[in-house]
């Protein structure tokens, strides 16, 4: 399944702790693109290997 990404709705602007929220249109779900040095589904963990 090819997902299309857009900015998340305003309801989810704070969803990603250390990253950018992207909206998976077809799945109706949020996803996070983490800033450098962070990992996790919501970019909530510092990457100790970075």
């Amino acid at each position: 399944v090819v997902s299309h990404f857009n900015d998340c709705p305003d309801s989810h602007t704070q969803f990603c702790f250390h990253g950018t929220c992207r909206f998976l249109v077809q799945e109706d779900k949020p996803a996070c693109v983490c800033h450098s040095g962070y990992v996790g589904a919501r970019c909530e963990h510092a990457d100790l290997l970075a």
Epitope: D7, P9, D10, S11
Partner: antibody, heavy 116, light 107 residues
Framework: VQLQESGPGLVKPSQSLSLTCTVT?????????WNWIRQFPGNKLEWMGY???????SYNPSLKSRISITRDTSKNQFFLQLNSVTTEDTATYYC??????????WGQGTLVTVSA | DIQMTQTTSSLSASLGDRLTISCRAS??????LNWYQQKPDGTVKLLIY???RLHSGVPSRFSGSGSGTDYSLTISNLEQEDIATYFC?????????FGGGTKLEIK
């Protein structure tokens, strides 16, 4: 996925309204948000709140002091409780599966009348 | 809360017609606009999500468009089974809110 609402069709003013949504074909702990929506006489729709697959809840601020949504994962059911009802709570109540922006699948609805 | 307005509460059309139902939001909802169909028996189905995307199983005669605060649903070749009430819903901001509905009737 199929959703089916059930519960009393008549509730007295000041009492609590309790409804059950039974979900088949999908586990409510797997994903998605499990919502309650109501439709007043005259067609106006109102989102009431949801319980997510993880168990977290979100409620419409207009109802926050009166509403509770819970679940029984062993029965794959979720529940609506609305306290201190008045005749203004007379509506058709729907349960629906949603994501973060839309309601993809709805139950058939159940009419609840609040009357003495 | 974001107010959703469907200015036309009822619409009369003939089978085979092309018709458009409008919906306006009280503020920019960034294309997070969905359309639902409610049949006379109360059954509700999602038709279109994110302004213009067809939900699975929905006939291609349904289409959606719009941006910012103004959105529309178009039925290109009206069929008997399309007789229903149509609701818009914004999904950008909690609490999610609905338009008042547009009831479609046959001339």
């Amino acid at each position: 996925v199929q959703l089916q609402e059930s519960g009393p069709g008549l509730v007295k003013p000041s009492q609590s309204l309790s409804l059950t949504c039974t979900v088949t074909g999908y586990s409510i702990t797997s994903d998605y948000a499990w919502n309650w929506i109501r439709q007043f006489p005259g067609n106006k729709l109102e989102w009431m709140g949801y319980i997510s697959y993880s168990g977290s809840t979100s409620y419409n601020p207009s109802l926050k002091s009166r509403i509770s949504i819970t679940r029984d994962t062993s029965k794959n059911q979720f529940f609506l409780q609305l306290n201190s009802v008045t005749t203004e709570d007379t509506a058709t109540y729907y349960c629906a599966r949603g994501g973060i922006t839309r309601f993809a699948y709805w139950g058939q609805g159940t009419l609840v009348t609040v009357s003495a | 809360d974001i107010q959703m307005t469907q200015t036309t509460s009822s619409l009369s059309a003939s089978l085979g017609d092309r018709l458009t139902i409008s919906c306006r939001a009280s503020q920019d909802i960034r294309n997070y606009l969905n359309w639902y169909q409610q049949k006379p028996d109360g059954t509700v189905k999602l038709l279109i999500y994110y302004t213009s995307r067809l939900h699975s199983g929905v006939p291609s005669r349904f289409s959606g468009s719009g941006s910012g605060t103004d959105y529309s649903l178009t039925i290109s070749n009206l069929e008997q089974e399309d007789i229903a009430t149509y609701f818009c819903q914004q999904g950008n901001t909690l609490p999610w809110t609905f338009g008042g509905g547009t009831k479609l009737e046959i001339k």
